[in-house]
């Protein structure tokens, strides 16, 4: 289980019309359900129920972003419609280039994502917990354009923007 | 089929507030942003700001903060935007419309928009 | 903010080929959509992501571009099209172009 490490891009506009760019580095693990892969894209924050249903109603796809789903406690959803790796497996299908699952509030998923499979995805699968998580999924909630890049190896520097 | 049934026109007075709704159907609402967006003749198309149904989080153009205020109703799938202290300048027709999957993605579906003319 | 800049109008023949200009005053990466207006309607998705047509859209049209120089193309041009044309970036939060009205002679 090698340490993925996961650097995110936040712009901020001001009253001005400037732009301020925010870069948070943050750690977590590739899970054996995917590929130890660098990746990047746009953060899209996806509940888990989010990811049961089909959309067949949709008819147009973006590729290329970054899934993020917090995980809930297992008490909440004794039948979950998919499995954590199903999950990911939906995501991936729907134009996800990785995702990250925060699995602090159901640790159990990291033993689930890690249970050797015979088909894992061909895009990382990373999990994140702790503080790592908490720092991601503020950036999320701001409802702001974010951009993660995921990489197996420590970045070389603090980047300021990198391009999609 | 994805669709946004926005509410009817509005002819309001300065100084005081008017609230535009926007009813979703043909998907679940809780799974994808909402944005606000306005046009005039004179300033073009100007995005407002956006929310999310699922956890009610919002961000603003900074020009709208103070004036437009986002909310939404999950069990009746709407969506809503405050227009408060309404001056002439806030005369305008005023669009809900969906993202695609990403913040960053296209408005791929729009509502019909709201006329709203402030006037005395 | 990024500002989107568009020529105002342009009129052309059924059967031409025309091209629609958008020019971002920084770097947006492929971030471009494109929209067309009809009067009294709301506008309607062509092109996502500079490149990419949208369901229901003749292939007719199409989009290209990156950085900061990004082209609507319509070949051929057919009466129905007479419309104004927006572009709009959503690299960081979202910014309109101003639009291009195109008339048929």
């Known amino acids: 289980k090698e340490t993925a490490f996961v650097e995110v891009v936040l712009f901020e506009s001001s009253p001005s019309g400037d732009y301020t760019t925010y870069t948070t580095g943050l750690t977590g693990r590739f899970s054996r359900a995917g590929a130890t892969l660098s990746a990047e894209g746009e953060i899209v924050q996806m509940h888990p129920l989010g990811l049961c249903n089909n959309n067949d109603e949709e008819d147009l796809y973006e590729y290329g972003w970054v899934g993020v789903v917090k995980l809930e406690q297992p008490e909440l959803d004794p039948k979950p419609c998919l499995t954590v790796l199903g999950k990911a497996k939906r995501a991936v299908q729907r134009g996800a280039t990785a995702v990250i699952f925060d699995v602090s509030e159901n640790p159990e998923a990291i033993d689930q994502l890690n249970q050797g499979s015979e088909d894992p995805l061909k895009r990382p699968v990373v999990y994140v917990k702790g503080a790592d998580a908490i720092k991601l999924m503020n950036i999320v909630n701001k409802q702001k354009v974010a951009r993660a890049r995921i990489q197996h190896r420590p970045p070389r520097q603090p980047t300021e923007y990198f391009d999609m | 089929q994805v669709q946004l049934q926005q509410s009817g026109a509005e002819l309001v007075k300065p100084g005081t507030s008017v609230r535009l709704s926007c009813k979703a159907s043909g998907y679940t609402f809780t799974h994808n942003h909402m944005n606000w967006i306005k046009q005039t003749t004179g300033q073009g198309l100007e995005w407002i700001g956006i929310i999310n149904p699922g956890s009610g989080g919002t961000n603003y153009n900074v020009r709208f903060k103070g004036k437009a205020t986002l909310t939404v109703d999950t069990s009746s799938s709407t969506a809503f935007m405050q227009l408060s202290s309404l001056t002439p300048e806030d005369s305008a027709v005023y669009y809900c419309a969906r993202n695609l999957i990403t913040i960053a993605g296209p408005f791929a579906y729009w509502g019909q928009g709201t006329l709203v003319t402030v006037s005395s | 903010d990024t500002v989107l800049t568009q020529s105002p109008a342009l009129t052309v023949s059924p059967g031409e080929r025309v091209s629609i200009s958008c020019r971002a005053s920084?770097?947006?990466?492929?971030?471009i959509h494109w929209y067309q207006q009809k009067p009294g309607q709301q506008p309607k998705l062509l092109i996502y992501k500079a490149s990419n047509l949208a369901s229901g859209v003749p292939a007719r049209f199409s989009g290209s571009g990156s950085g900061t120089d990004f082209t609507l193309t319509i070949d051929p041009v057919e009466a129905d099209d007479t419309a104004t044309y927006f572009c709009q970036q959503s690299w960081i939060d979202h910014t309109f172009g101003t639009g291009t009205k195109l008339e048929l002679k």
């Open positions: 920084e770097g947006v990466s492929s971030y």
